[in-house]
């Protein structure tokens, strides 16, 4: 922003009435009037160039400084070419001399030179020559000076001439300030240039109604330089959370719009399945039935609860049930939906019924689910299970209704067998089982499967109809992972537990041993 | 849940040695073998051999004799595959794998460790 | 060694159509035992394969029922009722009948 200058001296536009002192007086300077464009001009003027040895001073009046801390001072002059005097004037000059002193009173006219300092020698670019002059064309030049810091009340300058021809059309005293000045919505007060020209006087601005600085942001600072430019901004003001920027103001957001927070986007319209929003809304609150999860941002259209899984069945294979489902029709509009298995199980016989998850096994965690299948392992026999397959997404947890689907199962499967060890020998082992006589009639084989711990790459399996089994050919001094598994006419039965035996080693006796019961 | 998870990515230079790690988590390591696969770039499967993870007792396959060594620490549940004298033939991904819920097949698998030997 | 041959090395399908993967062992997959350890895995970009189908035709835990497996002795199938664009990637056939181990070349499942 260009600086704005503020006058304290206009000897141009005074129309002669400022009196300045000279000195000596009556000698020297004088004060002339002439007539340009049908406008009287003014203009202090001497040309004693013929006689040698001049000091003569024209002082101004005594200048209040006010806020000025540093004065510019713009001289327009003319200056006769010393060649156009007969002779050449030997002692003639080209220059004058500018000077300034501060004083916190009006001296009136006692005038001492003494008091007063050299600002600097004022010499013309331009001089006038004699055919300048007589065609009444005068070379205007015009020179400007500065000083600074100020301090006292206020000041005169004095123009002391050494023998020159000189005419002092225009003398303006100014100083500058930083014009008041609205940028990055933040306020910044007319502020008065510094004194020291390599300093810059850092100036704080404050946010326009409405606008904020945002957090972690720089407050708004701009630097007021000595021409009074405005340089180096530093920071910048948002507008608040329910306002836009328009122009250099901040605005309520329309009726039907939102900002949620201090940012330079604009107001954005209410999403989907929310409420008209008054005018400066930072939000806009869902429609009835539709929520906003804590994570959701805020331009995100409110949403709701899944239905219930559209799909679900249950497959019982031997001890286990698969579960298979199809995801619900409305997801709620969000896509973030999880599903959680429970299980519930009841004897027929009683009728009692309770939860199941300690004792099945999920091939998966049943909780927080993304696939829509689920294999449920380790099922009792002769029981009814009663599986839940709820869906929920983020919003869930804002309503107390569930949105679940049912689906039972009953296990015809036989228990597990009972294996033990009847004796072992350095290259087999002599295995029996059990299961309740009430199942027994439901089996037709059982199958052995039996392998090296340590090695699931390869295994064995023996088929049979009885209850024990001598599997040999095995090595020596070595631990089997041994399985007895019942097979009925629906396929598998359940499994035992894998159980760990260990031949003999050759030092042992090579004879059957036999294990006590 | 039952996790093979094994070491990062290696670059090694002809001659050299390399060790790569295979570490078991979820169901007991001792009980189920470990079986080690190749596949080089864009390339298939090839199987290289299997160690009992009880008795450390490993098995290669002839292609893979010599220069390969599979090995057990089984405190840490951790398989080894060690490479002697590389070759830029053995610049491939690595995979552990073994029949854990089903036997005699490859039902768990590593995440895989690429190896690239180049001078 | 037991050779796994699949072909085509890629098979172009659109989303919603029903793909067919075969694959054949230079000698049969039967067990002494009875069983055949023939066995799918699907490989992703970047990813460990993962097993799909095992002993010819039984799914692994959590695979989606639009895979199934079929074949005996030494041709075998894997099929993909309607593609989704999740099973895109390259399928293996696997033998572990037969020490060593052995693998298909793969069949890359892409877009049409």
């Known amino acids: 922003a260009q600086g704005k200058e503020v006058v304290l001296l206009d000897f141009a536009a005074a129309g002669g009435e400022l009196g300045w002192l000279t000195h000596p007086y009556g000698k020297g300077w004088d004060l002339m009037q002439n007539i340009m464009n049908d406008m009287p001009i003014y203009m202090y003027s001497v040309c004693n160039v013929m006689s040698g040895d001049q000091d003569n001073w024209l002082r101004t009046n005594w200048v209040y400084r006010g806020e000025a801390e540093r004065i510019f001072i713009e001289l327009k002059f003319t200056v006769r070419d010393c060649n156009s005097f007969p002779g050449g004037a030997s002692s003639c000059k080209e220059t004058f001399n500018l000077y300034y002193a501060e004083s916190d009173l009006d001296y009136g006219t006692n005038f001492q030179k003494r008091l007063f300092t050299k600002i600097d020698t004022i010499a013309p670019d331009e001089i006038t020559v004699s055919s300048d002059f007589e065609a009444r064309h005068v070379k205007l030049n015009v020179e400007e000076r500065s000083v600074g810091p100020l301090t006292r009340k206020g000041f005169y300058l004095a123009f002391q001439d050494i023998g020159a021809c000189v005419a002092l059309l225009s003398v303006r005293v100014y100083y500058k300030k930083c014009p008041e000045l609205l940028q990055g919505l933040a306020h910044f007060p007319e502020t008065i240039a510094g004194s020291d020209a390599p300093s810059l006087a850092t100036v704080a601005g404050t946010c326009v109604d409405h606008a904020v600085v945002p957090p972690g942001g720089e407050e708004p600072r701009m630097h007021c330089a000595v021409d009074g430019e405005w340089l180096v901004p530093i920071g910048q003001c948002l507008c608040q959370a329910g306002y836009e920027k328009v122009e250099d103001a901040c605005q309520a957001c329309s009726p039907g719009f939102f900002k949620f927070e201090a940012s330079e986007s604009p107001c954005l319209e209410c999403p989907e399945h929310t409420l008209p929003s008054p005018e400066g809304a930072t939000s806009c609150e869902c429609e009835e039935g539709f929520f906003r999860a804590p994570q959701d941002p805020a331009s995100m259209p409110c949403t709701r609860p899944p239905s219930a899984p559209h799909y679900l069945t249950a497959v019982g294979m031997g001890a286990k049930v698969e579960l298979r489902w199809t995801p619900p029709q409305d997801s709620g509009g969000r896509e973030d939906i999880v599903y959680s298995v429970t299980c519930e199980q009841c004897w027929p016989e009683s009728g009692e019924c309770g939860p199941c998850e300690a004792s099945v096994r999920y091939s998966e965690p049943p909780h927080g689910l993304t696939r829509t299948s689920v294999t449920v392992s380790d099922l009792e026999p002769h029981m009814n299970y009663t599986f839940t397959v709820e869906a929920r997404n983020g919003v869930s947890g804002l309503v107390t209704s569930r949105s679940f689907r049912t689906a039972s199962v009953s296990i015809n499967q036989t228990e597990p067998p009972k294996v033990r060890l009847e004796g072992r020998s350095t290259t087999s082992l002599s295995v029996s089982w059990s299961i309740p006589p009430p199942q027994q009639s439901r089996v037709w084989k059982y199958e052995v499967t039996y392998r090296k711990k340590g090695d699931s790459n390869s295994y064995n399996v023996r088929r049979t109809e009885g209850f024990s089994v001598t599997l040999d050919d095995l090595a020596p001094d070595t631990t089997y992972l041994v399985q007895v598994q019942a097979l009925t006419q629906e396929g598998q039965g359940a499994g035992s537990k894998v159980h760990e035996f260990q031949t003999l080693s050759p030092e042992g006796s090579g004879n059957l041993a036999v294990i006590g019961g | 849940q039952i996790q093979l998870v094994q070491s990062g990515p290696e670059l090694k230079k002809p001659g050299e040695t390399v060790k790569i790690s295979c570490k078991a988590s979820?169901?007991?390591?001792?009980?189920?073998?470990m079986n080690w696969v190749k596949q080089a770039p864009g390339k298939g499967l090839k199987w290289m051999g299997w160690?009992?993870?009880?008795?450390?007792?490993?098995t290669y396959a002839d292609d893979f004799k010599g220069r390969f060594a599979f090995s057990l620490e089984t405190s840490a549940s951790t398989a080894y595959l060690q490479i002697n004298n590389l070759k830029n033939e053995d610049t491939a991904t690595y995979f552990c794998?073994?029949?854990?819920?089903?036997?005699?097949?490859?039902?768990?698998w590593g995440q895989g460790t690429t190896l690239t030997v180049s001078s | 060694d037991v050779v796994m041959t699949q072909t085509p090395l890629s098979l172009p399908v659109s989303l919603g159509d029903q793909a067919s993967i075969p694959c054949r062992s230079s000698?049969?997959?039967?067990?002494?035992?009875?069983?055949?350890?023939l066995h799918w895995y699907l490989q992703k970009p970047g990813q460990s394969p993962k097993l799909l189908i095992y002993?010819?035709?039984n799914r692994f835990s959590g695979v989606p029922d639009r895979f199934s497996g079929s074949g005996s002795g030494t041709d075998f199938t894997l099929k993909i009722s309607r593609v989704e664009a999740e099973d895109l990637g390259v399928y293996f056939c696997?033998?572990?009948?037969?020490?060593?181990?052995?693998f298909g070349g793969g069949t890359k499942l892409e877009i049409k």
């Open positions: 000698q049969s997959l039967v067990h002494s035992n009875g069983n055949t350890y």
């Open positions: 979820g169901y007991t390591f001792t009980d189920y073998s």
């Open positions: 794998a073994s029949p854990i819920s089903l036997l005699r097949l490859l039902d768990y």
């Open positions: 160690i009992n993870t009880y008795t450390g007792e490993p």
């Open positions: 002993k010819v035709s």
């Open positions: 696997s033998q572990s009948t037969h020490v060593p181990w052995t």
